[in-house]
């Protein structure tokens, strides 16, 4: 049986995806992250 | 507040065709998510679901019926339209239209019924 | 087509009385967008069909509390704690998740 018409059981966010790269020192390279609403997640 | 009203001819004769109206207030079919149904229900027995429109025009029908059906709407004057072809006495029935709407934030049931219109077929 | 099973198909019961009536599908009604579209309906003697439950446990608004719905799958089922004259009628199980849409066959509450 096909399915009736009903909307997605979810609702999308939108959320500023912030990229950041922070210097550490001087021997020690960069963390380059990505934020997404206020967490670091890579 | 919402109401919706069904109206049709009553009695009809084997293999004519049914014209069903569903004049409805309170809500708009202009409205995003907002669909009618239709439903019927032989004397005595329980209920059929027949077809579906929605705002956007999409429509579904029961596959059983579906080569009988038609189902189509005037936003304008808040109607919705059934008809039914070849119709014969098993079709004698209280034929009701009803609301469902689409959303989040909806029900998303049939939350408002009309009082139903009775048809019968006979020779 | 999905098959709705009702049990049992009348239900005498004295005023004040629990009623609890059965809802079978003959196969899973769970919508891909994750609802379950199991919907309660009851037609007084002479009115429309009005919604009380919605979505398996919903109820509508202006429904009494003492209706409840509950369940999941392929099993529902619609409680009312304490029946009172005005609950008296047919009561029907629908889903709202495949096509074609069905009802069950009706449950009818009346006086014993």
């Known amino acids: 049986d096909a399915e009736f018409r009903h909307d997605s059981g979810y609702e999308v966010h939108h959320q500023k995806l912030v990229f950041f790269a922070e210097d550490v020192g001087s021997n020690k390279g960069a963390i380059i992250g990505l934020m997404v609403g206020g967490v670091v997640i890579a | 507040q919402v109401t919706l009203k069904e109206s049709g001819p009553g009695i009809l004769k084997p293999s004519q065709t049914l014209s069903l109206t569903c004049t409805f207030s309170?809500?708009?079919?202009?409205?995003?998510?907002?669909?009618v149904g239709w439903f019927r229900q032989p004397p005595g027995k329980g209920l059929e679901w027949l077809a579906h429109i929605w705002w956007d025009d999409d429509k579904s029908y029961n596959p059983s019926l579906k080569s009988r059906l038609t189902i189509s709407k005037d936003t304008s004057k808040n109607q919705v339209f059934l008809t039914i072809t070849n119709m014969d006495p098993v079709d004698t029935a209280t034929y009701y239209c009803?609301?469902?709407?689409?959303?989040?934030?909806?029900?998303?049931?049939?939350?408002?019924w009309g009082q139903g219109t009775t048809v019968t077929v006979s020779s | 087509d999905v098959v709705m099973t009702q049990s049992p198909l009348s239900l005498p019961v004295s005023l004040g009385d629990p009623a609890s009536i059965s809802c079978r599908s003959s196969q899973s009604i769970l919508h891909s967008n994750g609802n379950t579209y199991l919907e309660w309906y009851l037609q007084k003697p002479g009115q429309s069909p009005q919604l009380l439950i919605y979505?398996?446990?919903n109820r509508f608004s202006g429904v009494p509390d003492r209706f409840s719905g509950s369940g999941s799958g392929t099993d529902f089922t619609l409680k009312i704690s304490r029946v009172e004259a005005e609950d008296l009628g047919v009561y029907y199980c629908?889903?709202?998740?495949?096509?074609?849409?069905?009802f069950g066959a009706g449950t009818k509450l009346e006086l014993k």
């Open positions: 629908f889903q709202g998740s495949l096509v074609p849409l069905t």
């Open positions: 309170g809500f708009s079919l202009s409205t995003s998510g907002m669909g």
């Open positions: 009803a609301r469902r709407q689409l959303g989040l934030r909806s029900i998303d049931a049939m939350d408002y």
């Open positions: 979505k398996v446990s």
